[in-house]
Interface confidence: low
């Protein structure tokens, strides 16, 4: 599992040559059933906010027990609270399900701060605001946990949407999405639109607010603007991608691109922040500080520990730079860039003492385990996890928070040579073992 500010809270203290076809979402691409168009029943099926995670309603067992489940592309277990816990309003009661099957096997998952453990079984699972199917899936029934469930988050379990290789206790435990695709006609892809609030929400507002959409089996054109650009999934474990260049307000950080992916870069909806390797974080903060030097902020702000507040409606967005990540494209020597605004990387938080102010935390932090493109990044974009074609697509989200001057962007192509050198390679000649 990933080190750092992950949800549930796992905090630690890490272009194409011209004339080539662009890998955009076009009508020329072969159709797959259910791949394109409108998925009305799935739009707005997520609730929550970046600080506490985005969850979808699911039902488990027979008769169905309804639970809210955190959507996590950074893990691969479907795990639900299955015993009373002070932070849970409800939990999965296996003894009440006639379709529950015990696998007679335990599972233990430690995080940086906390853990969960439980018992493995299978049961019938469906997603009310998802495809009209029921699947038998592996479920980890969480019987004991520490600092896993979040008070007031309103979710009771976690849906790990990554690949089997990182499933616990081992890769033989088939993840939910694999079971879904195997047992139904749902195409092997899903897409996420996470809609950050842009302003602090109190508890009642969170429960009533729209958090976004998880489109299972397809792409909904109403959820993005412009074109979708795709980056290859480097390896099917986490959703690993390769970053080839980083810019702050258009200024290249000028680092060896290997540093950006040390030792991996992943797209993870279960992490709050944009997390960067130590050297990259330090260079990025130095550059962001320089760009925003008209105001001085305490060191604790840049460490993500201290809030900074402005009088309601007066946040000086314009003094903060935009951040661009260049991702490897699908075509040789081609990359594209995704650009986020301070509206994404300054996370709104409620400060009870100054409720009339707008308060923010700096949501870029240091990592010892590579780059993690968490909710901070994802809230700017509609993100397509195209597992069938081993690629991840980015387009500007129709719900991203911006101002009158700047907007998040997905742009390309950019010629970028030697991109393969930006990733960390396994020191062996035959890399085919990676694909087993």
């Amino acid at each position: 599992t990933q080190h750092g500010i992950r949800l549930p809270l796992r905090s630690g203290l890490g272009g194409a040559p011209l004339g080539l076809r662009l890998p955009r979402e076009t009508d020329e691409e072969p159709e797959e059933p259910g791949r394109r168009g409108s998925f009305v029943e799935m739009v707005d099926n997520l609730r929550g906010k970046s600080g506490q995670g985005y969850y979808v309603e699911m039902t488990v067992g027979s008769p169905p027990q309804t639970l809210n489940i955190l959507v996590d592309t950074g893990s691969s277990n479907f795990a639900v609270g299955a015993a009373p816990h002070p932070f849970l309003h409800r939990y999965y009661q296996r003894q009440l399900s006639s379709t529950y099957r015990d696998l007679r096997k335990g599972v233990y998952v430690p995080y940086t701060q906390g853990k969960w453990e439980g018992e493995l079984g299978t049961d019938l699972v469906s997603i009310p605001h998802g495809p009209n199917v029921t699947v038998r899936a592996n479920i980890a029934a969480i019987t004991e946990s520490d600092k896993f469930f979040i008070n007031g988050s309103n979710w009771e379990g976690i849906l790990g949407l990554a690949y089997a290789e990182i499933a616990r206790p081992d890769d033989s435990l088939e993840p939910f999405f694999d079971s879904l695709v195997k047992q139904t006609h749902v195409p092997n892809l899903f897409s996420l639109q996470l809609c950050g609030a842009g302003f602090p929400l109190n508890q009642s507002e969170v429960l009533a607010s729209v958090g976004g959409s998880m489109i299972i089996g397809g792409i909904d054109h109403s959820l993005y603007t412009g074109s979708l650009w795709y980056t290859p999934i480097r390896r099917e474990w986490y959703y690993e991608v390769i970053i080839v260049r980083v810019e702050i307000n258009g200024q290249d950080l000028k680092m060896d691109c290997k540093e950006y992916n040390y030792d991996k870069s992943i797209v993870d909806s279960g992490t709050t922040n944009l997390r960067l390797p130590k050297k990259v974080f330090e260079a990025a903060v130095k550059s962001i500080k320089a760009a925003s030097s008209t105001e001085k902020f305490p060191d604790g702000f840049w460490l993500g520990e201290q809030l900074v507040c402005w009088q309601a409606g007066t946040t000086p967005w314009n003094i903060f730079p935009v951040i661009s990540l260049y991702l490897m494209g699908e075509v040789t020597n081609q990359s594209f860039r995704i650009t986020i605004l301070p509206q994404q990387y300054l996370r709104p938080v409620e400060d009870v003492a100054t409720s009339q102010d707008d308060c923010y935390k700096f949501a870029i932090s240091q990592s010892s385990t590579g780059t993690v493109m968490g909710a901070v990044i994802m809230e700017g974009f509609y993100v397509v996890f195209d597992r069938a074609r081993k690629r991840i697509g980015f387009a500007v989200s129709a719900c991203h928070v911006h101002d009158e001057f700047r907007t998040a962007a997905v742009e390309g192509p950019f010629v970028t040579l030697d991109m393969e050198d930006c990733g960390y390679n396994i020191p062996q000649t035959d890399e085919s073992t990676l694909m087993t």
């Epitope: 599992t1 990933q2 080190h3 750092g4 796992r10 630690g12 203290l13 890490g14 430690p110 995080y111 940086t112 701060q113 906390g114 290789e165 990182i166 081992d170 890769d171 390896r235 474990w237 040390y262 030792d263 991996k264 010892s368 385990t369 590579g370 990733g423 960390y424 390679n425 396994i426 020191p427």
Partner: antibody, heavy 119, light 107 residues
Framework: EVQLVESGGGLVQPGGSLRLSCAAS????????IHWVRQAPGKGLEWVGW????????DYADSVKGRFTISADTSKNTAYLQMNSLRAEDTAVYYC????????????WGQGTLVTVSS | DIQMTQSPSSLSASVGDRVTITCRAS??????VAWYQQKPGKAPKLLIY???FLYSGVPSRFSGSGSGTDFTLTISSLQPEDFATYYC?????????FGQGTKVEIK
């Protein structure tokens, strides 16, 4: 059952080389960090370095940087510690250990293999 | 590098005693500290991670506490099999560093 088995230790002269192996079984090798930790006779534990078998990234203690190299072969579920330019102070029991990427701890250890550097 | 300093370096205790070992980091390491037990001729075993979380299968008489720079390992009621050397380790940053060890001997 998780198992880590080191091999390749022995007596070597100062300036010489040795390659230790760590054969792993009972878990998804590429899903964990593999660390090498050493313990000089009668002394405490000293971290030597680590590798991510999946990504290939490595890091080393300053005391061995430039002399030791860690590698891994995921097809064999084996990590290696190549030790060059050995010194008397490198004499120790060398352990390989598995750890999650977070937290940065070692939850399973091998039995260790003794490396003696002496003329 | 972050230095980890353990105290005492050794102690004598009897079965049933409450034993406390402390570890001080040379800088703030939040709660990123682990504790290990090592018996002669054997490999270390993980007891506690993230300062206070008991590793799977470790008896509940072991507990850990602390944050920032000061950390404690407590054995609430010492058992015969607990006589060993105990090491703390910071997992806050690379390189991970260990304390020099505390040997718990039979009185």
């Amino acid at each position: 059952e998780v198992q880590l088995v080191e091999s390749g230790g022995g007596l070597v002269q100062p300036g010489g080389s040795l390659r230790l192996s760590c054969a792993a079984s009972g878990f998804t090798f590429s899903g964990y960090a593999i660390h090498w930790v050493r313990q000089a006779p009668g002394k405490g534990l000293e971290w030597v370095g680590w590798i991510s078998p999946a990504g290939g990234s490595t890091d080393y203690a300053d005391s061995v940087k430039g002399r030791f190299t860690i590698s891994a072969d995921t097809s064999k579920n084996t990590a290696y510690l190549q030790m060059n330019s050995l010194r008397a102070e490198d004499t120790a029991v060398y352990y390989c250990a598995r750890g999650p990427f977070s937290p940065w701890v070692m939850d399973y250890w091998g039995q260790g293999t003794l490396v003696t550097v002496s003329s | 590098d972050i230095q980890m300093t353990q105290s005492p370096s050794s102690l004598s205790a009897s079965v049933g005693d409450r034993v406390t070992i402390t570890c001080r980091a040379s800088q703030d390491v939040s709660t990123a500290v682990a504790w290990y037990q090592q018996k002669p001729g054997k490999a270390p075993k993980l007891l506690i991670y993230s300062a206070s979380f008991l590793y799977s299968g470790v008896p509940s008489r072991f507990s850990g506490s602390g944050s920032g720079t000061d950390f404690t390992l407590t054995i609430s009621s010492l058992q015969p099999e607990d006589f060993a050397t105990y090491y703390c380790q910071q997992s806050y940053t690379t390189p991970p560093t260990f304390g020099q060890g505390t040997k718990v001997e039979i009185k």
